[in-house]
């Protein structure tokens, strides 16, 4: 039995479709491409004859159509009017005419999305962030990416308007990174450019290293004190130490050579971000003693946290 | 006390190189970063980039890439910064200084700076 | 790259004059910002970080303000010493930019 195949189904407004005959009968020698259901005069797009090749258009003819010995018929540059059903008409010897109706849908084109936000630098557990797809396109379905991943699931999460808007609620650092919209038809998909999204913490409770083992040795005078205060932060913190209350410098690691029983006492990181409004640090008692035993802190560290 | 001395001023050709040092002494050297500051006659200040001396990472601004390299030898406290293909508009007087602390701090020590002239 | 964009870009004031330069960054800088003063000849000097904290040994006739974009620097009452280009910088993160400066003089 004759059928039409259309390739693509689905079409993307601009591209091109083909539409394939198949099980042609043996006996022809012509055949009629028409727009829509039924063999009209009117709606004829074009002829062709096969004896001659001798392809001839019809009334329907928009100068798009290209019909092939093999009875198959390419409309290029497709637009949306071109949705519907088409009909073709092969020609036989005997004169028993056979009919076959395909059809195919044109979607429009999809614009490249783009994703405007209410807040790419948005603080941990203070804020929520909305992005929003753009533009608004009928009858197109809207995805969401993060890091080149489909969304996870997260009750944090919000899809809303159709799904053109992603709400992060009171974000968290693990929400950092590139997200991406896409917008799909049947016929074809688009994908916006990534926008990143920053997300500001800490700074966290500090740590000082080297962790001294066990936590209530002390250290040999004579010996080099070298603390390491670190927290994570984003932006990265600004360090700065107090020893027993004094400021002193404003670097991540404090270094005193040759320590005395002068340098005893409170030895405190503080950490601040300006851009979450917070600080945060930790003390740590050292005590130096004049003769042999292991070196090491003291074990009374605490620490403190202010918003 | 904090000092940073640089090396003297130079004279070049354009194509050539430069190699400007900067000694420090007064803290620990390898506790704080060294950026490099630029400043054409009658003009602005340009940051260049900087070294940590702890690593000897560097980060450069976008318009020096392929053409500085900042390098430091911690036996001398001196960081260099060498700047090639150097054009007429290069003339200007390079600032070392040091960061006031670690991470997003301003520089709070300078050198006396060094005058680079780029003349055929 | 942010951009740094001082006003004005000179101002003559009196001895005793209340004096504001402004500064306004392209991006939200959250009071990561720096000023300098330049002297004629003489190398940058840092008066203010995190866009009020005055470096020790500043007088406290300077002063700076702002926050996310928008920052000021003032001199409650200009000095003769006070002559020089004042530059402002952000130091959130690299690469760090200045403005183009603010010439300073005495009427």
């Known amino acids: 039995k004759l059928t039409i195949e259309s390739t693509p189904f689905n079409v993307a407004e601009g591209k091109e479709v083909l539409l394939l005959a198949h099980n042609l009968p043996q006996n022809r020698i012509g055949y009629s491409w028409y727009k829509g259901e039924r063999v009209d005069g009117n709606s004829l797009i074009v002829g062709y004859v096969i004896g001659t090749q001798q392809a001839t258009p019809g009334p329907a003819y928009s100068g798009r159509e290209t019909i092939y010995p093999n009875a198959s018929l390419l409309i290029q540059n497709v637009t949306q009017n071109d949705t519907g059903f088409y009909t073709l008409q092969v020609i036989k010897s005997d004169l028993v005419n056979e009919e076959a109706t395909g059809q195919f849908h044109v979607y429009p084109e999809l614009p490249k999305p783009s994703i405007s936000s209410n807040n790419s630098n948005p603080v941990e557990d203070k804020d929520a962030v909305a992005f929003t797809c753009e533009p608004e396109v009928q009858n197109t379905t809207y995805l969401w990416w993060v890091n080149g991943q489909s969304l996870p699931v997260s009750p944090r999460l919000q899809l809303s308007n159709g799904n053109m808007t992603l709400t992060l609620l009171s974000v968290k650092r693990n929400d950092a990174g590139s997200y991406e919209c896409e917008i799909q038809n049947p016929a074809s998909a688009n994908r916006s450019d990534p926008v990143t999204l920053n997300v500001l913490y800490g700074p966290d409770v500090p740590t000082i290293s080297p962790i001294i083992s066990p936590p209530d040795s002390s250290y040999l005078s004579g010996a080099n004190l070298n603390l390491s205060c670190h927290s994570a932060s984003n932006p990265s913190p600004q360090y700065s130490w107090r020893i027993n209350g004094i400021p002193q410098q404003h670097t991540q690691v404090l270094f005193i050579a040759k320590i005395t029983p002068n340098n005893n006492g409170t030895y405190a990181c503080f950490v601040s971000n300006l851009a979450t409004g917070r600080n945060n640090s930790i003390v740590k008692s050292i005590t130096v003693s004049a003769s042999g035993t292991s070196p090491g802190l003291s074990a009374g560290a605490h620490h403190h946290h202010h918003h | 006390q904090v000092q940073l001395v640089q090396s003297g001023a130079e004279v070049k050709k354009p194509g050539a190189s430069v190699k400007v040092s900067c000694k420090a002494s007064g803290y620990i050297f390898t506790s704080y970063y060294l950026h490099w500051v630029r400043q054409a006659p009658g003009q602005g200040l340009e940051w260049i980039g900087y070294i940590n001396p702890q690593t000897g990472y560097t980060s450069y601004a976008q318009k020096f890439q392929g053409r500085v390299t900042m390098t430091r030898d911690t036996s001398t406290s001196t960081v260099y910064m060498e700047l090639s293909s150097l054009r007429s508009e290069d003339t200007a007087v390079y600032y070392c200084a040091r960061e006031y602390g670690n991470y997003n701090y301003p520089l709070d020590y300078w050198g006396q700076g060094t005058l680079v002239t780029v003349s055929s | 790259d942010i951009q740094m964009t001082q006003s004005p870009s000179s101002l003559s004031a009196s001895v005793g004059d209340r004096v504001t330069i402004t500064c306004r960054a392209s991006?939200?800088?959250?009071?990561?910002l720096a000023w300098y003063q330049q002297k004629p000849g003489k190398v940058p000097k840092l008066l203010i970080y995190n866009y009020k904290n005055l470096v020790e040994g500043v007088p406290s006739r300077f002063s700076g303000s702002g926050s996310g974009t928008d920052f000021t620097l003032t001199i409650s009452s200009l000095q003769p010493e006070d002559v020089a280009t004042y530059y402002c910088q952000h130091h959130l993160g690299t690469p760090y930019t200045f403005g183009q400066g603010t010439k300073v003089e005495i009427k």
């Open positions: 991006e939200n800088q959250y009071g990561y």
